[in-house]
Interface confidence: low
């Protein structure tokens, strides 16, 4: 059977920022930090001041699906987490303001946010089988699962 998509005409409309200035820690208790201008990585920190603080914005799908769709922005910046392909690092994309409407190829800015207990997963809207993940000695990337770590704890009130 050939690939087929119902996603091409789905439009996502920005609703509001739902979380401010939180830290993401992976299952090894490593925090996400800035590796450079473009990439993120994970490291075990003694001082959480070095960790990246994120804001999370919620979007509503025109398809009215049950998933919580979010954008991730580095707090107090105009940098947004952007998916590439499997095993490729996520990029930090600079935009003048949070997009009001996202559709088509721009869905690489969006993630489905799932929670299971204290575990948080971020699946790429553009690549629904791939998660934001940390990988030893590598950037934060998109991955389908082990050996990459795909579950995160959200640490709030880190302003």
């Amino acid at each position: 059977s050939a690939p087929f998509s119902f996603l091409s005409n789905v439009k996502y409309n920005f609703m509001r920022i739902i979380k401010y200035e939180f830290i993401l820690n992976d299952a090894l208790n490593q925090s996400i930090i800035r590796a450079n201008d473009q990439y993120l990585t994970a490291a075990a920190l003694h001082n959480l001041d070095e960790a990246v603080k994120f804001d999370m914005g919620a979007y509503k799908s025109s398809k009215d699906d049950a998933k919580i769709t979010v954008i991730l922005r580095i707090s107090k910046t105009q940098l947004y987490v952007t998916a590439q392909d499997e095993d490729q690092p996520v990029l930090l994309k600079e935009m003048p303001e949070i997009p009001k409407t996202i559709t088509g190829s721009e869905t690489n800015l969006l993630f489905f946010w799932e929670t299971h207990g204290t575990k948080n997963y971020f699946t790429s809207v553009a690549h629904p089988n791939l998660f934001i993940a940390t990988k030893q000695d590598y950037w934060v990337c998109l991955a389908g699962g082990p050996p990459s770590i795909t579950d995160f704890q959200i640490l709030e009130n880190q302003a």
Epitope: V10, A66, P128
Partner: nanobody, 116 residues
Amino acid sequence: EVQLLESGGGLVQPGGSLRLSCAASGFTFVRYDMAWVRQAPGKGLEWVSSINKSGALTSYADSVKGRFTISRDNSKNTLYLQMNSLRAEDTAVYYCAKGWASFDYWGQGTLVTVSS
């Protein structure tokens, strides 16, 4: 090789019920969202319902909301669609598909005919 094998279709009277099953193999079922789509005679593909990896999140087309229930058993690598209060307009070939709204594989389909 990815295989999706639907079963459970048949002829049912309006107002009746059917339960479709989809046996999945050739991939790690628990890692993927799954969906049902259908194709009525002479019509295009219509998305029916989706379910996430864990089964915690579901979504339905307006035309089936409140009548159909999607579920999955990850221990059996099986997807289900419980269809109640069936109507003539539900007559279609029902396909199980791998993905939430973008599908790289689907099965051969099972025919559901709603008629008195």
